[in-house]
Each structure stands twice: as structure tokens, then as C-alpha cells.
């Protein structure tokens, strides 16, 4: 069985301010079990954008039905984009751990650029 990979097919995405950004991510396997999380930026200061397990992320919707038992599409949409949302977004697979889940694989990242609304 091949080891799970996290695929972010888009290196960059350009979105107009006020519009919705779609950030694509798929996993190549269902195993190991564990959640997907999305972050803006890398390293210790990265910002959590979406957590499959828990939390309230009002601007974020998932493209696919994550309650499907065979789901491997973890793409998200972020609404009402502003210039402050620009940055590189990473889709990260965690494997279950105790007491905390352990980062397992990260996608290569998608750079979100925001085009200002014409004045």
C-alpha cells in the first residue's frame, strides 16, 4: 500500500477582493486515520484556517461532503476575500496520536493573491 500523499494541484490562485477563493487539496489514501487542517503560512506562527475535527470557521466551506466515509477531497472555499488574506495556504494531514494528533504530510502550498477591486 503506497504511503499517503497530500496533493495541492494549484501553485497559485488569483482572486478579486470580495470574491470567493477555492483552494484545492486531495489525499491519495484514507489511511492513516486523522484529520486534515488548513493553515496560512508555515512554521510555528502559522494561522489555522480550517480544522476538520472542530472549531468554528464562518468564512470557510468545504467543497466536498467530509462526512462521506470514503472522502479524499479536502478542498475549501474562503468567502469575501480581502487583501489581508493573501499568503500561502497549506493543506496538512495529521495522523491520530495521544494525547495530540501528529503532523504527517503537508501539501506543497497554494499562494493566494488578491486583486484589489477597481475604484
Amino acid at each position: 500500500e503506497e504511503e499517503l500523499q497530500v496533493i495541492q494541484p494549484d501553485k497559485s490562485v488569483l482572486v478579486a477582493a470580495g470574491e470567493t477563493a477555492t483552494l484545492r487539496c486531495t489525499a491519495t489514501s484514507l489511511i492513516p486515520v486523522g484529520p486534515i487542517q488548513w493553515f496560512r503560512g508555515a512554521g510555528p506562527g502559522r494561522e489555522l484556517i480550517y480544522n476538520q475535527k472542530e472549531g468554528h470557521f464562518p468564512r470557510v466551506t468545504t467543497v466536498s461532503d467530509l462526512t462521506k466515509r470514503n472522502n479524499m477531497d479536502f478542498s475549501i472555499r474562503i468567502g469575501n476575500i480581502t487583501p489581508a488574506d493573501a499568503g500561502t495556504y497549506y493543506c496538512v494531514k495529521f495522523r491520530k496520536g495521544s494525547p495530540d494528533d501528529v503532523e504527517f504530510k503537508s501539501g506543497a502550498g497554494t499562494e493566494l493573491s488578491v486583486r484589489a477591486k477597481p475604484s
Partner: antibody, heavy 117, light 108 residues
Framework: EVQLVESGGGVVQPGGSLRLSCAAS????????MSWVRQAPGKGLEWVAG???????YYGDSVKGRFTISRDNSKNTLYLQMNSLTAEDTAVYYC???????????WGQGTLVTVSS | SYELTQPPSVSVSPGQTARITCSGG??????YAWYQQKPGQAPVTLIY???KRPSNIPERFSGSSSGTTVTLTISGVQAEDEADYYC???????????FGGGTKLTVL
């Protein structure tokens, strides 16, 4: 407060059919996967079927081809259509809400199905 | 037959610690939970995701995992803890929810 209330149980003859319902309240039903779990008299728990928020379905081996799980998100209701019933299907049937990883966090009080001639 | 294995019975004196084990699933493809059931009542979820406790469950109930075995620990057992305890799982490789056969906890 999360509430799950099952109904529709009763006595049915072998070979007969029955439809169970589970009315959900206190949470966003349309966002959660749901399952049916049963317990035969004096026996342990057995998972019967599950359904995603978008109505993809999954079944235990003992009921495949005979039972159908479905949901109506506009009515906040989960269903279990049971056909070709046998004595081995006699049990208390519980509906349960699934967690993000398909375990169960809330359970209904159960409804008894008795298959007997 | 049950896919997950747990002891049929465990006995403990009040105030002591009870441990119930469950095994049978692959670590990489399984999540586990523990459910308590008292006679004539519906199950109650004690532990989910191997070791997470719902906010309404007393702290004396805890879950842990080591390899392919998970353990429910009840510290300072009380008379009201006498019940059946079921180990349940989600198997990502088969999309199913297996259960253990249940463990009857007797408080002496």
C-alpha cells in the same frame, strides 16, 4: 440540547417490512452523519447502517440488500426501511449521531422491533 | 462474533481502579470509543477518538491507547458505575463500525 427520538417500532411477521424514524433536534442535523445501531435482547451492540450528510450510505453485512437508510434534512429526520425481516432482526434500534470520525456521541432512547409470527 | 475483543466481565471494589481493554483493530485505520449502558437504558458515550472525554462525563473515566489495544480506566469506582461497557470502533479500511461483545462491570 441534542435530542434523538426514535419511533416506528412494533411487532411484524417474518418476511414483513417496517420503517423506523428518528427525529433530531438541538443541532444542525444536515451537517452530521448519522447511524442506526441495534441490540438484540440480552446481546451486545451491532452497527446496522450509516449515512453521510449528503446521503451516501453504508451498511453492515447482516442487513445489506434488505435495509435502506435515508434522511430528510428539511425535516431533521433519519429513516431506516427494513424489508424481508427475520427473527434475527428482533432488537432495540437506536439512532446515533456521528462524530467527525464516524464514532457516536449522542444516542436516542431506542425503539423495539419484534419479528414474530 | 465480534471483531473487537474485550473481557466479558470485570469486578472491582468501590474506590478501586477498573481497567477494561479492547483489541482487534489496526492502529493506522481505527478510531475507538467507549460506551456505557445501564439496564434498560440507551448507551452513553464515555470516550471517543481513543482518549477524548465529552464534557459531561466525570474525570474518573479516561481512555488510553497503546498499539492496537485501547483501555478504559475508571478511577475511584462508584456503585453507580456498575454497567455494561462496550468498546466500539470505526474501521476506515472497511467503512464499518465494529463493536466488542461488552464487559459487565461488577462493583463488589
Amino acid at each position: 440540547e441534542v435530542q434523538l427520538v426514535e419511533s416506528g417500532g412494533g411487532v411484524v411477521q417474518p418476511g414483513g417490512s417496517l420503517r423506523l424514524s428518528c427525529a433530531a433536534s438541538g443541532f444542525t442535523f444536515s451537517s452530521n452523519a448519522m447511524s442506526w445501531v441495534r441490540q438484540a435482547p440480552g446481546k451486545g451492540l451491532e452497527w446496522v447502517a450509516g449515512i453521510s450528510s449528503g446521503s451516501d450510505t453504508y451498511y453492515g453485512d447482516s442487513v445489506k440488500g434488505r435495509f435502506t437508510i435515508s434522511r430528510d434534512n428539511s425535516k431533521n429526520t433519519l429513516y431506516l426501511q427494513m424489508n424481508s425481516l427475520t427473527a434475527e432482526d428482533t432488537a432495540v434500534y437506536y439512532c446515533a449521531r456521528e462524530t467527525w470520525n464516524h464514532l457516536f456521541d449522542y444516542w436516542g432512547q431506542g425503539t423495539l422491533v419484534t419479528v414474530s409470527s | 462474533s465480534y471483531e473487537l475483543t474485550q473481557p466479558p466481565s470485570v469486578s472491582v471494589s468501590p474506590g478501586q481502579t477498573a481497567r477494561i481493554t479492547c483489541s482487534g483493530g489496526s492502529y493506522s485505520s481505527y478510531y475507538y470509543a467507549w460506551y456505557q449502558q445501564k439496564p434498560g437504558q440507551a448507551p452513553v458515550t464515555l470516550i471517543y477518538s481513543d482518549d477524548k472525554r465529552p464534557s459531561n462525563i466525570p474525570e474518573r473515566f479516561s481512555g488510553s491507547s497503546s498499539g492496537t489495544t485501547v483501555t478504559l480506566t475508571i478511577s475511584g469506582v462508584q456503585a453507580e458505575d456498575e454497567a455494561d461497557y462496550y468498546c466500539g470502533g470505526y474501521d476506515q479500511s472497511s467503512y464499518t463500525n465494529p463493536f466488542g461483545g461488552g464487559t459487565k462491570l461488577t462493583v463488589l
